[in-house]
């Protein structure tokens, strides 16, 4: 959400969120690495277009004008350069200078190699355990956020995974209008919606560049579940890899699994929309998981089958009015799975993206808690990989990218919530080989084995 | 003045296990990486693994995993090497280093003096 | 793993010559690389990083270049004191493994 050093009185106050760099002359002696070229403090441009009519609440939420309701005022990095105080490179980009181009490329989990998997699971177990070196998260809304005393800035540490796991509950959370009204809950800034893909996108690579720095592995990258199998088993599901199902109780990942020993974040739902409070690195129970287990609902006991990839990606338009889970059509609705894979909405479906989820039947299933079971992370590099191929295909082609009257979030100049420094989706909206330094070892079907560069 | 002092030599039997130390001056611990390098007689030098004295990280090279542990005391300045069910194979000079993150660099920039350690029955 | 292939593994060379040193990787590894310099019974030396980069008080007449797989370390105007072996290593994936490398004898 915001660096540790903007997390206090005086930058809120100021509404000034420019970290220092290296400032050999003192505190904010080199904001944004100004000394040496990096960046400077500019004023933070925010998407003032108009959204659709599904949030009638302006001026309640803090998501609204992302960052604007709490910093005013950022970093702008100059070249390659990024990061809250400018001090690492681009996406893709290395060197003291960031001139140097690198590429990562992000493998189907299957094949990697019995210590290449291994590496990965420890990697994601050190993530849930290892405090976030830059971010912390508010645990009060902006009202609050000064704590009770107006004087004790209301926020915490929290992890490298629940970091992540925790921004995607704030991009999902209802909105709160306060004690005694029930929060508005048809809101939200990374779903349904044109920015589903792009949010998502930098939601993995802030995952993976965290990791790459918790690592010192600058080649380190998060690899992808092929879910388009067809079959009614989850095949990385397995004790080497995610954690297979547990004897005990078939809901729960099995002891062999380090994945068993994982806590949940953000699960009290209830007490964030009736007293108006936000999650916290509190961690609760466990990951619960039983693929093809929803005796009840028969259509998501199987994953999509390897067609569906194929018929989503011959869906030439990337998003149709009016922008939302309805959007018939339209890629980005076809491949979150709210369309047939043909393209063609239909309220009973749930496809792809949709699907895999709710194939999961638990922890995964379920928004605002679904980044707690790590197989998200496969599932949306997956995804994401669907989408880079989309780009290749078709250019790029950002024009029915809605500039406005998409849901509030999905604008295509909006910043995406709550990401820092501020990001817009246009950015997430390039071939990543070419832009954002990764590609994909992918071979779509019918199609030969390629990284998709 | 940067400065990574090791412990003196051991000489250890086979199956037992050691722990070597290597207290820094000069630097602030937790700000680095702090690396362990083997060189066995008249070879090459053989990278061991990191911590990460700020929050008691460690990666190994899956060749060492299981038989090298490294720790840290960040109130002495101290990381230390603890070697299990040592057999002649890693009698060894055993170095500690460390790594300036700053932009990523890529080098381990200064070096301790090195641990002997004889596995000897 | 990236394996490291340094060579050659041995040169002799005069006073006043210039050498050179190479490593190849077994994958790009995009410039993470670092050259050391080892004398007999001492630690290792740090003389070049990001594969280009002098480290400081490093003489002048050693300079790193290379790119992707290939990398090489070049010490002109031999001194004696550069006799000793010398290392390469990468950053770009876990284990950072060495270069077998090469020993240097001033003639």
């Known amino acids: 959400q915001f660096p540790r050093e903007c997390a206090n009185i005086e930058a809120l106050r100021r509404g000034v969120c420019c970290p220092d760099l290296l400032p050999s002359s003192g505190p904010g002696t080199d904001p944004c690495g100004s000394s040496s070229g990096r960046g400077r403090c500019v004023a933070v441009i925010a998407d003032s277009r108009p959204h659709s009519r599904h949030y009638p609440h302006d001026g309640k939420d803090d998501r609204e004008a992302w960052p604007l309701r709490f910093f005013n005022r950022t970093c702008q990095c100059n070249d390659n350069f990024s990061g809250h105080n400018c001090g690492t490179c681009r996406p893709g980009w290395r060197g003291a200078a960031c001139n140097q181009k690198i590429l990562t490329v992000r493998r189907n989990l299957l094949d990697l190699s019995p210590e290449e998997k291994s590496h990965f699971v420890r990697a994601l177990d050190m993530a849930k355990r290892t405090t976030h070196p830059q971010f912390v998260i508010a645990t009060r809304r902006l009202e609050d956020i000064l704590g009770p005393d107006g004087n004790t800035p209301q926020f915490e540490n929290i992890s490298v995974y629940n970091y992540f796991v925790w921004t995607h509950y704030y991009s999902v959370k209802k909105t709160f209008l306060g004690t005694g009204q029930e929060s508005f809950g048809d809101v939200d800034f990374s779903h349904e919606g044109p920015a589903f893909l792009t949010w998502h996108r930098y939601h993995l690579l802030q995952l993976e560049r965290d990791m790459q720095e918790m690592l010192q592995e600058p080649s380190f990258s998060l690899p992808y579940w092929n879910f388009a199998t067809g079959k009614n088993v989850c095949d990385v599901c397995t004790d080497d890899l995610m954690g297979s199902r547990s004897n005990f109780d078939s809901t729960l990942i099995s002891p062999n699994s380090v994945f068993s020993q994982w806590r949940v974040v953000c699960e009290s739902l209830e007490e964030y929309d009736t007293l108006g409070t936000l999650c916290n690195s509190t961690e609760g129970g466990p990951i619960r998981r039983n693929p093809a287990g929803n005796v009840g609902r028969p259509a998501v006991q199987r994953l999509p089958e390897p067609q569906d990839v194929t018929q989503c990606l011959e869906v030439r338009v990337f998003d149709t009015p009016p922008f939302y889970s309805n959007s018939t059509d339209s890629f980005r609705n076809t491949v979150e799975g709210y369309s047939a894979p043909t393209g063609k909405y239909d309220p009973a479906v749930r496809s792809l993206h949709n699907l895999a989820h709710l194939f999961l039947n638990g922890t995964g299933g379920q928004t605002h808690l679904s980044p707690n079971d790590p197989i998200f992370v496969l599932l949306h590099t997956f995804t994401d990989a669907v989408f880079d191929e989309w780009l290749r295909r078709y250019n790029a082609d950002i024009s029915t990218f809605p500039l406005e009257n998409a849901p509030i979030g999905h604008n295509r100049q909006y910043n995406m919530v709550p990401f820092w420094p501020p990001v817009t989706n246009t950015e997430m909206f390039v071939t990543a080989p070419d832009n954002l330094g990764y590609a994909y070892e992918v071979q779509w079907p019918g199609q030969e084995f390629t990284v998709s560069e | 003045e940067v400065q990574l002092q090791q412990s003196g030599a051991e000489l250890v039997r086979p199956g037992a296990l050691v722990k070597l130390s290597c207290k820094t001056s000069?630097?602030?611990?937790?700000?680095?990486?702090l690396h362990w390098v083997r060189q066995r007689p008249d070879q090459g030098l053989e990278w061991i693994g990191w911590i990460n004295p700020d929050n008691g990280n460690t990666v190994y090279d899956p060749k060492f995993q299981g038989t090298a542990s490294l720790t840290a005391d960040t109130s002495s300045n101290t990381v230390y090497l603890q070697l299990s069910g040592l057999t002649s194979e890693d009698t060894a000079v055993y170095f500690c280093?460390?790594?300036?993150?700053?932009?990523?660099?890529?080098?381990?920039?200064?070096w301790g003096q090195g641990t002997t350690v004889t596995v000897s029955s | 793993d990236i394996q490291m292939s340094q060579s050659p593994a041995s040169l002799s060379a005069s006073v006043g010559e210039t050498v050179t040193i190479t490593c190849r990787a077994s994958?790009?590894?995009?410039?993470?690389l670092a050259w050391y310099q080892q004398k007999q019974g001492k630690s290792p030396h740090l003389l070049v990083y990001d594969a280009k980069t002098l480290a400081d008080g490093v003489p002048s007449r050693f300079s790193g270049s290379g790119s992707g797989t290939q990398y090489s370390l070049k010490i002109s105007s031999l001194q004696t004191e550069d006799s000793g072996n010398y290392y390469c290593?990468?950053?770009?994936?876990?284990?950072?493994?060495f270069g077998s490398g090469t020993k240097l004898e001033i003639k």
């Open positions: 290593q990468h950053f770009w994936s876990l284990p950072f493994t």
């Open positions: 280093t460390r790594r300036d993150y700053t932009y990523e660099k890529a080098a381990l920039d200064y």
């Open positions: 000069g630097f602030n611990i937790k700000d680095y990486f």
């Open positions: 994958g790009n590894i995009y410039n993470y």
